[in-house]
Interface confidence: low
């Protein structure tokens, strides 16, 4: 009762909101809401009624399974969707689906904040720039991942000659997509000409 399921999808995709269990037998009424009381569609044993909402024309209800199909979801569709079923007994049952719609991440730009030759070692500070997104960062040196504690938007490290890498890659990802940006250096410690 009231169990919350999380779902993450990419914007522009078509989504099916459904529950993992079968609907109560011979239910009287089924209603899908977004937020707690905004009706999307209601089925009452005869027909489906679609309500005036931002979803009108983009949704379809399957009364058999209770599944709600939404086409071309956008970030504005982020919400908790609630399916409420009124049983013949008069009791109510509800299921919640928290839908998170994410845009595909854009390709990141690597900015060289500082590059300095220090006693035959190379001090490197790179930032991975991506506009206003909540993403995960993974840094690679010549395709080898840096340690986990270095994984954020800024890579700051001092490399000894035996650890020099020629190219540094920042991979940004969210749960629906991933993109890479790469910058290459000339040994021992200068930016390569592009």
């Amino acid at each position: 009762q009231g169990h919350l399921v999380h779902m993450t999808v990419v914007s522009g995709s078509n989504v099916t909101l459904n529950i993992s269990e079968s609907l109560p037998e011979n239910y009287k009424q089924l209603t899908w809401f977004y937020t707690f009381d905004q009706k999307i569609v209601e089925w009452d044993s005869r027909k489906s009624k679609y309500f005036e909402s931002k979803f009108k024309g983009r949704v379809r209800l399957d009364p058999q399974s209770g599944a709600l199909y939404i086409s071309k979801v956008q970030k504005e569709d982020n919400s908790t969707y609630i399916m409420r079923v009124l049983k013949k007994t008069g009791n109510e049952q509800e299921w919640k689906i928290k839908l998170q719609v994410l845009d595909p991440v854009p390709k990141p730009v690597i900015k060289i904040e500082k590059i300095e030759d220090m006693d035959d070692n190379c001090y490197l500070k790179l930032s991975c720039v991506i506009p206003g997104e909540s993403v995960n960062y993974t840094w690679y040196g010549d395709k080898r991942p840096f340690p986990k504690e270095l994984q954020n938007s800024v890579l700051e490290t001092t490399l000894m000659p035996h650890n020099y890498s020629r190219c540094y890659t920042c991979q940004v990802s969210n749960s629906v997509s991933s993109k890479n940006g790469t910058v290459c250096l000339s040994p021992p410690c200068t930016l390569a000409r592009s």
Partner: antibody, heavy 118, light 108 residues
Framework: EVQLLESGGGLVHPGGSLRLSCAAS????????MSWVRQAPGKGLEWVSL????????YYADSVKGRFTIFRDNSKNTLYLQMISLRAEDSAVYYC???????????WGQGTLVTVSS | EIVLTQSPGTLSLSPGERVTLSCRAS???????LAWYQQKPGQAPRLLIY???SRATGIPDRFSGSGSGTDFTLTISRLEPEDFAVYYC?????????FGQGTKVEIK
């Protein structure tokens, strides 16, 4: 006949607490969402809180969020509103009302008066 | 949130007269999700109209509702002595549910 009977109101000092109850009869209580609506003396109506029939979902007006808790005991056909950190502006008659399919309120109880004053 | 403005604030009328109460919304009320309630002194509100124009169970047919979008009206075709009260409109098309400030219908 559907009946709703509120109780638990009274005089309380600012910062104090109260618990309101609403005893329901005449309908399958667990099948319906319930709400609290308040009315300050001489003023209009303000929706306060909502709870789904199962009790699994609760919602609050911004003015009471974090201070009020709505809950229900379907075995006792009773709705509750726990109020803490009460302020003078919470003074009102508190009505419980049956939510008709998350739309309008019908019927309402007779109300219980809460007065917050030092 | 949708703000509902009722007018006039007070109406002084005699029994038998026709009454028209107005409720204007700050933005369109979805699918005419508007209700009207009657409240007498010392009593709880009572549902009169829902869906802008449907009469609730047991409400006399002298009460009627109309309107859509942002403009709604409650009409009492012929005032009875028991109709003197405060009338509230309420929208349930979007969250949070909101009420108008009320119109008082008093005896002249």
């Amino acid at each position: 006949e559907v009946q709703l009977l509120e109780s638990g109101g009274g005089l309380v000092h600012p910062g104090g607490s109260l618990r309101l109850s609403c005893a329901a009869s005449g309908f399958t209580f667990g099948g319906y969402a319930m709400s609290w609506v308040r009315q300050a003396p001489g003023k209009g109506l303000e929706w306060v809180s909502l709870i789904s029939g199962s009790g699994g979902s609760t919602y609050y007006a911004d003015s009471v969020k974090g201070r009020f808790t709505i809950f229900r005991d379907n075995s006792k056909n009773t709705l509750y509103l726990q109020m803490i950190s009460l302020r003078a502006e919470d003074s009102a008659v508190y009505y419980c009302a049956k939510y008709s399919n998350y739309d309008y309120f019908d019927p309402w109880g007779q109300g219980t008066l809460v007065t917050v004053s030092s | 949130e949708i703000v509902l403005t009722q007018s006039p604030g007070t109406l002084s009328l005699s029994p038998g007269e026709r009454v028209t109460l107005s409720c204007r919304a700050s933005q369109s009320v979805s699918s005419s999700y508007l209700a009207w309630y009657q409240q007498k002194p010392g009593q709880a509100p009572r549902l009169l109209i829902y869906g802008a124009s449907s009469r609730a169970t047991g409400i006399p047919d002298r009460f009627s509702g109309s309107g859509s979008g942002t403009d709604f009206t409650l009409t009492i075709s012929r005032l009875e002595p028991e109709d003197f009260a405060v009338y509230y409109c309420q929208q349930y098309g979007s969250s949070p549910r909101t009420f108008g400030q009320g119109t008082k219908v008093e005896i002249k």
